[in-house]
């Protein structure tokens, strides 16, 4: 009978704790309520991962995590009668999941992916040290907008690195970018240990280069106008404008955080266009401009990947050497 048990009494442990993997890297633990829990107890479940990380107290009898399964991961679960973290939960029950078997030295290394211009993802990796040179690799990927796991078809080599690219287009007006792409690389023969990675869609984004539309002089200032890469709004980008002067052989680099086209000298209302005024430029000399962009922390987690440089554009006259 469960009569007058005090809520502070330690509850029995949860039962039937099990673990499974969905997609490529979604690990799900489920359990049943404890047997013989006191009737006046509103059950809550305390759980944390093996290293005491991500403590959680919730009423659900499941917990999931998106994690690259390159290492063993364990969840400990206990039951309690309140949301109070200081309440001692029941005996904790633990369930672990191990990565697929295989020689760790056979697994690929440096598995990383870059989302190019929010239109396709390019992943690359190095072969494991303990693998045969004729190993054939396969990359699998999954994200929320896919119904099932897909196999990447376009395997290529760049030097010692292997790679594969697949279409991944930003979906407008959705929480698409708040999610991640799950990646796994293994070999066709099943001889190597699979490698996993999770790529958050707010990081590792490399924009296409911008396109310079117009250069013009006003007094001793150089006005630069360019078109940003498709799929990006200008406030989400950070710019680097490089100006080389042929006569003085100077090389000036300007880091531009905001590039609004508010000056009357700039062509107005051109969609997705940015502008910058370079001060103190000699109009009677040849000036060559190029621009590159990268994502900023306003919209993205990562701000390390510069685009390639734009095509150069020049303005002014090349002086004759006397």
């Amino acid at each position: 009978g469960g009569g007058g048990a005090a809520p502070t009494e330690t509850q029995p442990p949860v039962t039937n704790l099990s673990v499974s993997v969905e997609n490529l890297c979604t690990v799900i633990w489920t359990w049943n309520p404890p047997e013989g829990a006191s009737s006046n107890c509103s059950l809550w479940y305390f759980s944390h991962f093996g290293d005491k990380q991500d403590k959680k107290i919730a009423p659900e009898t499941r917990r999931s995590i998106e994690v690259p399964l390159n290492e063993r991961i364990c969840l400990q679960v206990g039951s309690q009668c309140s949301t109070n973290e200081s309440e001692k939960p029941s005996i904790l029950v633990e369930k672990c999941i191990s990565p697929p078997e295989g020689d760790p030295e056979s697994a690929v290394t440096e598995l990383q992916c870059i989302w190019h211009n929010l239109s396709y993802m390019k992943c690359s990796w190095l072969p494991g040290r303990n693998t045969s040179p004729d190993t054939n690799y396969t990359l699998y990927y999954w994200h929320r907008s896919l119904e099932k796991i897909h196999q990447c078809e376009n395997i290529f080599r760049e030097g010692q690195y292997f790679g594969c690219s697949f279409d991944l287009t930003k979906v407008k007006d959705s929480s698409f970018e708040q999610h991640s792409v799950q990646i796994m690389v293994k070999d066709n023969a099943g001889k190597i240990k699979p490698s996993f990675n999770i790529v958050p869609l707010t990081s590792r984004v490399k924009p296409d280069p911008p396109h310079i539309k117009n250069l013009s002089f006003h007094n001793d200032d150089l006005y630069v106008q360019w078109e940003n890469p498709q799929n990006f709004i200008s406030r989400c980008l950070f710019y680097e404008v490089e100006v080389n002067n042929s006569q003085t052989e100077t090389h000036n680099v300007f880091y531009v955080q905001e590039a609004k086209c508010e000056n009357p000298e700039f062509e107005r209302n051109v969609e997705n266009t940015s502008c910058f005024m370079v001060p103190g430029v000699l109009p009677d000399t040849l000036n060559t401009v190029r621009i590159r962009v990268k994502t900023n922390k306003l919209c993205y987690e990562d701000d390390k990947l510069w685009s390639n440089w734009s095509q150069e554009m020049s303005i002014g006259k090349k002086r004759n050497s006397t």
Epitope: E105, E110, L126, G159
Partner: antibody, heavy 118, light 107 residues
Framework: EVQVLESGGGLVQPGGSLRLSCAAS????????MTWVRQAPGKGLEWVST????????YYADSVKGRFTISRDNSKNTVYLQMNSLRAEDTAVYYC???????????WGRGTLVTVSS | EIVLTQSPDFQSVTPKEKVTITCRAS??????LHWYQQKPDQSPKLLIK???QSFSGVPSRFSGSGSGTDFTLTINSLEAEDAAAYYC?????????FGQGTKLEIK
């Protein structure tokens, strides 16, 4: 033409330091691991250290672990070997080599001589 | 660590002769074995990759064979310019290891 060229060797006292450089040209530097191999006078070849193309994976021979540091600057197409706490047994010609494929060395530099002596 | 043992350590041969150098690994390394040639006062040069694949630009008289633990470098019809030290190298796992070398002298 694919080339690698070492520099920075010389005479150093035991316990001293030296930094070797290896400048590469003629290939996409960041796509290839670079390796240092040494050869003591009149002896065979000994692998010293390797750094992967992007610099994320670094490996050392037990004989130099904790004393030598390999690094690379992909913007300069250069790999470095910082050698600290040098010993007499580190005396050797140090070769820089470009790795290819499944870990073989297809291009070697001419080598730079490091002499550790008091 | 995988130990490579070459034999012979030294060989004196006459031009046009066929030369065989062997390399034995302390454990199976598949085809992850490569052969290098080092002429006096020069840096090593790749001859054979993956046990049997000739590297580009290497004369056809050089060939390699074997897999697992036993490997062979063969020089058919030796030429005077082949006087050098020859090294086998294992690249399966780390550390990379070299054989002790075989010095080839032309009579």
């Amino acid at each position: 033409e694919v080339q690698v060229l070492e520099s920075g060797g010389g005479l150093v006292q035991p316990g001293g330091s030296l930094r070797l450089s290896c400048a590469a040209s003629g290939f996409t530097f960041s796509n290839y691991a670079m390796t240092w191999v040494r050869q003591a006078p009149g002896k065979g070849l000994e692998w010293v250290s390797t750094i992967s193309g992007r610099g994320y994976s670094i490996y050392y021979a037990d004989s130099v672990k904790g004393r030598f540091t390999i690094s690379r600057d992909n913007s300069k197409n250069t790999v470095y070997l910082q050698m600290n706490s040098l010993r007499a047994e580190d005396t050797a010609v140090y070769y820089c080599a470009k790795e290819e494929g499944h870990w073989y060395f297809d291009v070697w530099g001419r080598g730079t001589l490091v002499t550790v002596s008091s | 660590e995988i130990v490579l043992t070459q034999s012979p350590d030294f060989q004196s041969v006459t031009p046009k002769e066929k030369v065989t150098i062997t390399c034995r690994a302390s454990q199976s390394i598949g085809s992850s074995l490569h052969w290098y040639q080092q002429k006096p006062d020069q840096s090593p040069k790749l001859l054979i990759k993956y046990a049997s694949q000739s590297f580009s630009g290497v004369p056809s008289r050089f060939s390699g064979s074997g897999s697992g633990t036993d490997f062979t470098l063969t020089i058919n019809s030796l030429e005077a310019e082949d006087a050098a030290a020859y090294y086998c190298m294992n690249s399966l796992g780390l550390p990379y290891t070299f054989g002790q070398g075989t010095k080839l002298e032309i009579k």
